[in-house]
C-alpha cells in the first residue's frame, strides 16, 4: 500500500450517527448464519492517527506477544517488525515463541519509496477484539526496512487483507485471511468502518479514542445507515472494482470510463488519499477549482503539498463540491453512486499551526497505477469485503464527518450501459513488477 501518503487514522469523535435508520432492504438474499447482526466485541477495535493508518491489536506466538497491526486491503502479506527499529516501541521476538516455525525463506518487498525485507515463518495468531479463534498463519518477520515504519504511528506490522495473487514472494504464500477462513468457521467476509475525526488528534487523543471497526466474518447493522449497495470484485488480486462515471457537484467529468480504471481501480485501506489516474486527476482538479472559484488556493495545495488554514471553526465547507463515483452494480446495466464530501477529501493536519487555526491538505492526488479508493473514500462509508460472493458493499457510515447541509451518500440504481467496457485489461507482464509502483 502507499507509503509516503499513508492514511488518515483518526477517531470517530467528529461524526455522530445520522439519526433514524432507513428500514433494511427486504429483497436481500438470505444470509448464512452469523454473517449479519451484532458483533459487539469487534466494534471500535481500530485506532490510528491522521495520515498514518488504521490498526488493530493482534497477538502472535506462544505465549502471546501483543502488537498493533495496520489494516491494509491493498496488500496480502502479514508482516511484522521483528528486530529493533527507532520507530518501534515493541517487535515480534520469534525466539520467545514456542510455536514459531521457520520457513527458511526470505521475502523482499520494494515500494516506489522505501522497502521492507524479512524472513518467512508461521506462528499462532489471534485478534483479541475479533473472532474467538487462533490460527496458524504465515508471518514475514521484518528484519530490515526503509521508509516503512512511521514515527509515532503506534503500529508495528501490517495485515495484508487482499488476495494471494499479490502476496510476496509469490502467490503460494497463503494470506492471513485465507488461513483464517480455512482453519475456522469464520465466514469469508470482513467489513471496515474507518472513522475520520474531521479534526486533528494529538498522540494522547489517538490512544484514548476510537478509529473505527473491523468486523471479521460479518456485517454490523449499527455501523451504517440506509442500504448496502454492492459492486463486483472484478478480479481477485487487489480488491479491484470498476468505476463507470465520475461527477463533481453533479457535473459529469465526461471522460471515457476506461480512463477512470486505467490501469485498475482498487479499494485500499492502506492508502490515505483518493488517487486518480493523471488525466482524471487533472480533469477533477479543474472541476473542483471551478466549483470553488470564489476562493483561490495555491498551486501547491492542489498538489497535496501546501496546507490551507482557516480560523478555527470557519472552514468554508460549502464552497467545495461533493464528489460522486459511480460503481458497476450487481445487475446488468445497473450502477450506484457513492458521494463524498470535502470533509473527507480535505484532511486535517495536526501540529502545524496554532490552536486558532484549522489546517488541511488536499487528499486527492495523482496516480500512475490507477484509481486508489483510499481512506478518503472509505471514511465516508461502511465497506463490506464480501469475498464469498466476490463483491464489495458500500453504505453510509454512521461515523462519517459531515455538516448540517450535506452528508455522504450511497444511492441507486442508475441505468448505465456497456459497463464492462470501462474495465482496463492490463497486458500480461512479469508479475514481479506488480507491486513495485505503489507510492
Amino acid at each position: 500500500t502507499q507509503h509516503g501518503i499513508r492514511l488518515p487514522l483518526r477517531s470517530g469523535l467528529g461524526g455522530a450517527p445520522l439519526g433514524l435508520r432507513l428500514p433494511r432492504e427486504t429483497d436481500e438474499e438470505p444470509e448464512e448464519p452469523g454473517r449479519r447482526g451484532s458483533f459487539v466485541e469487534m466494534v471500535d477495535n481500530l485506532r490510528g492517527k491522521s495520515g498514518q493508518g488504521y490498526y488493530v491489536e493482534m497477538t502472535v506466538g506462544s505465549p502471546p506477544q501483543t502488537l498493533n497491526i495496520l489494516v491494509d486491503t491493498g496488500s496480502s502479506n502479514f508482516a511484522v517488525g521483528a528486530a529493533p527499529h527507532p520507530f518501534l516501541h515493541r517487535y515480534y521476538q520469534r525466539q520467545l515463541s514456542s510455536t514459531y516455525r521457520d520457513l527458511r525463506k526470505g521475502v523482499y518487498v520494494p515500494y516506489t519509496q522505501g522497502k521492507w525485507e524479512g524472513e518467512l515463518g508461521t506462528d499462532l495468531v489471534s485478534i483479541p477484539h475479533g473472532p474467538n479463534v487462533t490460527v496458524r498463519a504465515n508471518i514475514a518477520a521484518i528484519t530490515e526496512s526503509d521508509k516503512f515504519f512511521i514515527n509515532g504511528s503506534n503500529w508495528e506490522g501490517i495485515l495484508g487483507l487482499a488476495y494471494a495473487e499479490i502476496a510476496r514472494p509469490d502467490d503460494s504464500l497463503e494470506p492471513f485471511f485465507d488461513s483464517l477462513v480455512k482453519q475456522t468457521h469464520v465466514p469469508n467476509l470482513f467489513s471496515l468502518q474507518l472513522c475520520g475525526a474531521g479534526f486533528p488528534l494529538n498522540q494522547s487523543e489517538v490512544l484514548a479514542s476510537v478509529g473505527g471497526s473491523m468486523i471479521i466474518g460479518g456485517i454490523d447493522h449499527s455501523l451504517y445507515t440506509g442500504s448496502l449497495w454492492y459492486t463486483p470484485i472484478r478480479r481477485e488480486w487487489y480488491y479491484e472494482v470498476i468505476i463507470v462515471r465520475v461527477e463533481i457537484n453533479g457535473q459529469d467529468l465526461k471522460m471515457d470510463c476506461k480512463e477512470y480504471n486505467y490501469d485498475k481501480s482498487i479499494v485500499d485501506s492502506g492508502t490515505t488519499n483518493l488517487r486518480l489516474p493523471k488525466k482524471v486527476f487533472e480533469a477533477a482538479v479543474k472541476s473542483i477549482k471551478a466549483a470553488s472559484s470564489t476562493e483561490k488556493f495555491p498551486d501547491g495545495f492542489w498538489l497535496g503539498e501546501q496546507l490551507v488554514c482557516w480560523q478555527a471553526g470557519t472552514t468554508p465547507w460549502n464552497i467545495f463540491p461533493v464528489i460522486s463515483l459511480y460503481l458497476m452494480g450487481e445487475v446488468t446495466n445497473q450502477s450506484f453512486r457513492i458521494t463524498i464530501l470535502p470533509q473527507q477529501y480535505l484532511r486535517p493536519v495536526e501540529d502545524v499551526a496554532t490552536s486558532q487555526d484549522d489546517c488541511y491538505k488536499f487528499a486527492i492526488s495523482q496516480s500512475s497505477t490507477g484509481t486508489v479508493m483510499g481512506a478518503v473514500i472509505m471514511e465516508g462509508f461502511y465497506v463490506v469485503f464480501d469475498r464469498a460472493r466476490k463483491r464489495i458493499g458500500f453504505a453510509v457510515s454512521a461515523c462519517h464527518v459531515h455538516d448540517e447541509f450535506r452528508t455522504a451518500a450511497v444511492e441507486g440504481p442508475f441505468v448505465t450501459l456497456d459497463m464492462e467496457d470501462c474495465g482496463y485489461n492490463i497486458p500480461q507482464t512479469d508479475e514481479s513488477t506488480l507491486m513495485t509502483g505503489r507510492a
Epitope: 472559484s293 470564489t294 476562493e295 483561490k296 488556493f297 495555491p298 498551486d299 501547491g300 495545495f301 503539498e305 501546501q306 496546507l307 490551507v308 488554514c309 501540529d351 502545524v352 499551526a353 487555526d357 489546517c359
Partner: antibody, heavy 120, light 108 residues
Framework: QLQLQESGPGLVKPSETLSLTCTVS??????????WGWIRQPPGKGLEWIGN???????YYNPSLKSRVTISVDTSKNQFSLKLSSVTAADTAVYYC????????????WGRGTLVTVSS | EIVLTQSPATLSLSPGERATLSCRAS??????LAWYQQKPGQAPRLLIY???NRATGIPARFSGSGSGTDFTLTISSLEPEDFAVYYC??????????FGGGTKVEIK
C-alpha cells in the same frame, strides 16, 4: 508595468481606526492570478503579515489581528483597502501593500510603503 | 505555529566575499520557502521562491537551497548593492504568514 501605491493618513490617534488604500496601476486587480495583501513593519523590526484579499472579496487575516482588521476591494477603482480598528502605539509601522503571485504563494511585487504613526 | 529562525543576526563581510545565510524552520515546510531582500528605506524584494528558484530579474550570484527545516541563501560574491537585510518566509501553511527575524549583511 504593474505598480502598487499606498495612500492614507500618516498620523492616527490611539483608539481610532487606521485606513489605508492601495491603488493598482498598469494592470487589473481582477486578475485571477493574484491575491493582494497587506504587510507591516514596525520601526527597526521585522515583517508581519496582516491579510490578503482576492478580487472576488474572499479574505484571509492574521489570527492575531483578525478581530481588528477589515480588508476590502473595489474593482471599479482598481483598489484594495485596509482598516485597522482600536489602534495603539504598537500599531505604528510602515504599511506595505503587495501582490501575492507565483501560485498565490509569494509576495512578488510591493508598494513603497507608508509610515503610519499612532500618537495623540 | 511554525517559527523561522534566521542566523546569524548580523553578517559582516567585504565586497567580493561569499555570504551564507541560514533559515531554520521549527518543523518541515517542504520546499515552500522564500527569501526577500530589503534595503534601508525600501520595500522588500522577492529574491528566491520555492527554496531555490530565482525570481525574475534576480542576478545569478543569488542562490537558494534546502528543504524540510534547513535552508540557505548564498550570495556567491557580494556586490556593494547587496548589503541589506534578508528575510525568509514560509508558505507551507497558507496564507503565507510567517517571516524570519532577518539577517543583516553589513560591510566589514
Amino acid at each position: 508595468q504593474l505598480q502598487l501605491q499606498e495612500s492614507g493618513p500618516g498620523l492616527v490617534k490611539p483608539s481610532e481606526t487606521l485606513s489605508l488604500t492601495c491603488t493598482v496601476s498598469g494592470g487589473s486587480i481582477s486578475s485571477s492570478s493574484y491575491y493582494w495583501g497587506w504587510i507591516r513593519q514596525p520601526p527597526g523590526k521585522g515583517l508581519e503579515w496582516i491579510g490578503n484579499i482576492y478580487y472576488s472579496g474572499s479574505t484571509y487575516y492574521n489570527p492575531s489581528l483578525k478581530s481588528r482588521v477589515t480588508i476590502s476591494v473595489d474593482t471599479s477603482k482598481n483598489q484594495f483597502s485596509l482598516k485597522l480598528s482600536s489602534v495603539t502605539a504598537a500599531d505604528t509601522a510602515v504599511y506595505y501593500c503587495a501582490r501575492l503571485g507565483h501560485g498565490y504563494s509569494y509576495f512578488d511585487l510591493w508598494g513603497r510603503g507608508t509610515l503610519v504613526t499612532v500618537s495623540s | 505555529e511554525i517559527v523561522l529562525t534566521q542566523s546569524p543576526a548580523t553578517l559582516s563581510l567585504s565586497p567580493g566575499e561569499r555570504a551564507t545565510l541560514s533559515c531554520r524552520a521549527s518543523q518541515s515546510v517542504s520546499s515552500y520557502l522564500a527569501w526577500y531582500q530589503q534595503k534601508p528605506g525600501q520595500a522588500p524584494r522577492l529574491l528566491i521562491y520555492d527554496a531555490s528558484n530565482r525570481a525574475t530579474g534576480i542576478p545569478a550570484r543569488f542562490s537558494g537551497s534546502g528543504s524540510g527545516t534547513d535552508f540557505t541563501l548564498t550570495i556567491s560574491s557580494l556586490e556593494p548593492e547587496d548589503f541589506a537585510v534578508y528575510y525568509c518566509q514560509q508558505v507551507y501553511l497558507w496564507p503565507p504568514r510567517t517571516f524570519g527575524g532577518g539577517t543583516k549583511v553589513e560591510i566589514k
